[in-house]
């Protein structure tokens, strides 16, 4: 058993049929010695008396808010949550496996640049009695500070018969060094509580591996005289790290016909312009990627050819 | 070439070679063998390799003030990785394919380090750690980890040389 926060405790249980459970001793936070009784949740049934209460925690029916009283007055509370371990593996019932980029990916994170700011998100099908708390650091043995905001519900989607809820959080490394080569990963830890179930999820990454630039901006076409060719130009996104001579991007320019089956013409360039042939009803798209480190491509920025 | 006393390196040549190194480091990575182990090998070998850190002067401001600190750090790393790529980790079982880009990568690391270090002038180099793989699966795991950290190292080096070529070239 360990304390999650004041008066909230997590009991770790091996979860299998007829498991013996854990013996837990609760102590009433009071100078009083006599006449103390204990109840669980809203029930008025007295579970025991005395300054301490010993219980065998085996299942969710044994978890909840234990309250000690004296003469009708509440003295203190202890909320017990359960953390299940099945066959040596902690349960992951609350969050959905996003399966990208690999199985057992519950948290996904992205950064728009090297400033040390990043966003993480996760999915659940649970709509009520759900709380999240997020902590982060750079490294784990001698952790350096990363400040995270509160997790918020950022999207709702309907998937078949189910509703899916997306939560996200923004974090900022306290003393980021954008030009350095990271040697210690960022660690993100999410505590999730649904009713009386506690779970924790972690992700470990380097900012360089979660970089996804915003799409190029100001995408423009300039027809070339007496030619089917056009000059496409664009600019670095505002959110990308500066100076651009140091934090350089590379670009992919694509000409795509109306039909998805039509052959795509692609050009790769380090410049912020390219010359392509504009076909009727086609569109031109450009996306960006870090020039020197193959993290994610941005989403496409597009303009019609006409 | 860099010369003692802090003259400029051939920024443009270094830029081209470091960009080639980036490409080679990424093309070598998937080709060192099928690898599920990398998904689980969470303990970092990167504690054992030189990093371009915050105080090394490799940021734009530091390069403007005095690029020598940064170039020395890059040179140290290039020699270090060149030694690792020539070690038993990459030459032992399982054998790399004959056309593996690791050979080219090895040669390019040496080429860039020579561009940075003139004859008769020696910067300190770091000892190569004893990672002591005794099994082929351990070598394979280390190859992935070393190439992953090399990708990060050469990305910073390439940014340094690109910025130098754009702003510090004579």
């Amino acid at each position: 058993i360990w304390e999650l926060k004041k008066d909230v405790y997590v009991v770790e249980l091996d979860w299998y049929p007829d498991a013996p459970g854990e013996m837990v001793v609760l102590t009433c936070d009071t100078p009083e010695e006599d006449g103390i009784t204990w109840t669980l949740d809203q029930s008025s049934e007295v579970l025991g008396s005395g300054k301490t209460l010993t219980i065998q925690v085996k299942e969710f029916g044994d978890a909840g808010q234990y309250t000690c009283h004296k003469g009708g007055e509440v003295l203190s509370h202890s909320l017990l949550l359960l953390h299940k371990k099945e066959d040596g593996i902690w349960s992951t019932d609350i969050l959905k496996d996003q399966k990208e980029p690999k199985n057992k990916t519950f948290l996904r994170c992205e950064a728009k640049n090297y400033s040390g700011r990043f966003t993480c998100w996760w999915l659940t099908t649970i709509s009520t009695d759900l709380t999240f708390s997020v902590k982060s650091s750079r490294g784990s043995s001698d952790p350096q500070g990363v400040t995270c905001g509160a997790a918020t519900l950022s999207a709702e989607r309907v998937r078949g018969d189910n509703k899916e809820y997306e939560y996200s959080v923004e974090c900022q490394e306290d003393s980021a060094c954008p030009a350095a080569e990271e040697s210690l990963p960022i660690e993100v830890m999410v505590d999730a509580v649904h009713k009386l179930k506690y779970e924790n999820y972690t992700s470990s990454f380097f900012i360089r591996d979660i970089i996804k630039p915003d799409p190029p901006k100001n995408l423009q076409l300039k027809p070339l005289k007496n030619s089917r060719q056009v000059e496409v130009s664009w600019e670095y996104p505002d959110t990308w790290s500066t100076p651009h001579s140091y934090f350089s991007l590379t670009f992919c320019v694509q000409v795509q016909g109306k039909s998805k089956r039509e052959k795509k013409d692609r050009v790769f360039t380090d410049k912020t312009s390219a010359t392509v042939i504009c076909r009727k009803n086609a569109s031109i798209s450009v996306r960006a990627q870090d020039r020197y480190y193959s993290s994610s491509w941005s989403e496409w920025a597009s303009v019609p050819c006409s | 070439r860099a010369v003692p006393g802090g003259s400029s390196p051939a920024w443009t040549q270094c830029q081209q070679l470091s960009q080639k190194l980036c490409t080679l480091a990424w093309s070598a990575h998937p080709l060192v063998g099928h690898m599920d182990l990398r998904e689980e090998g969470d303990e970092e070998t990167t504690n054992d390799v030189p990093h371009i850190q915050c105080g090394d002067g490799c940021d734009p401001q530091g390069l403007r003030d005095n690029s020598q600190f940064c170039l020395q750090r890059i040179h140290q790393g290039l020699i270090f990785y060149e030694k690792l790529l020539g070690s038993d980790i990459f030459t032992g079982e399982p054998s790399l394919l004959p056309d593996s880009p690791v050979g080219q990568l090895h040669a390019s690391l040496l080429g860039l380090s020579q561009l940075l270090q003139p004859e008769g002038h020696h910067w300190e180099t770091q000892q190569i750690p004893s990672l002591s793989p005794s099994q082929p699966w351990q070598r394979l795991l280390l190859r992935f980890k070393i190439l992953r950290s090399l990708q990060a190292f050469v990305a910073v080096a390439a940014r340094v040389f690109a910025h130098g070529a754009a702003t510090l070239s004579p």
């Epitope: - | 599920d36 699966w137 351990q138 980890k145």
Partner: antibody
Framework: EVTLKESGPVLVKPTETLTLTCTVS????????ISWVRQPPGKALEWLGV???????NYNSGIKSRLTISKDNSKSQVVLTMTNMDPVDTARYYC???????????????WGQGTTVTVSS | DIVLTQSPDSLAVSLGERATINCRAS??????????MHWFQQKPGQPPKLLIY???NLESGIPDRFSGSGSRTDFTLTISSLQAEDVAVYYC?????????FGGGTKVEIK
């Protein structure tokens, strides 16, 4: 289908040399390492040695001086030679494939049926 | 050499009940976060069969009532609901250092 089949004498005399052959099919010896493992009657398993994809070998230090493992990739055969046999070497000898280096980390994923070798005069 | 000590030596479990076998190594069998510990099942007259590789990965074709956990020096094989066909001897094996070594085996029977 992956198969490994051990062949060789059932009975050898003390001080003689044992030669066992493992013939494999369904995979190439240039892609997978082969180990030899033995099991005395009613006892636990003992690893003898391995021949890697490139032909290098590692042996159990306890019997290293008596062991040689070689292979012929084109014939898909691995040969175990063990000199100066003794009654304590009586065991079932297994030829075993080591799983893909990058996934299995030294786990042995396919085993032959084994061949029982008795050392007796 | 790395010595692997299995416990218990034998285990009698009722059908449908849980069986847990432990394997302790005399030194760590982890290398940069990878546990080179594997589990085998051997039935009478048959060669061993790989069940779990790298401490916790289920070999294809093995029922998911088998699971493995642990790292460094302490490892566990669990059969969540024992079936009649699970009666066998179970061995752990390490491949972190030469020579590869096996545990002494744990015999699982039905109570």
């Amino acid at each position: 289908e992956v198969t490994l089949k051990e062949s060789g004498p059932v009975l050898v005399k003390p001080t003689e040399t044992l030669t066992l052959t493992c013939t494999v099919s369904g995979f190439s010896l240039t892609s997978y390492a082969i180990s030899w493992v033995r099991q005395p009657p009613g006892k636990a398993l003992e690893w003898l040695g391995v021949i890697w994809t490139g032909g290098g070998t590692n042996y159990n230090s306890g019997i290293k001086s008596r062991l040689t493992i070689s292979k012929d990739n084109s014939k898909s055969q691995v040969v175990l030679t063990m000199t100066n046999m003794d009654p304590v070497d009586t065991a079932r000898y297994y030829c075993v494939r080591e799983g893909d280096y990058g996934s299995y980390a030294g786990a042995m994923d396919y085993w032959g049926q084994g061949t029982t070798v008795t050392v007796s005069s | 050499d790395i010595v692997l000590t299995q416990s218990p030596d034998s285990l009698a479990v009722s059908l449908g009940e849980r069986a847990t076998i432990n394997c302790r190594a005399s030194e760590s069998v982890d290398y940069y976060g990878i546990s080179s510990m594997h589990w085998f099942q051997q039935k009478p007259g048959q060669p061993p069969k790989l069940l779990i590789y790298r401490a916790s990965n289920l070999e294809s074709g093995i029922p998911d009532r088998f699971s493995g956990s642990g790292s460094r020096t302490d490892f566990t094989l669990t059969i969540s609901s024992l079936q009649a066909e699970d009666v066998a001897v179970y061995y752990c094996q390490q491949a972190n250092k030469d020579p590869y070594t096996f545990g002494g085996g744990t015999k699982v029977e039905i109570k």
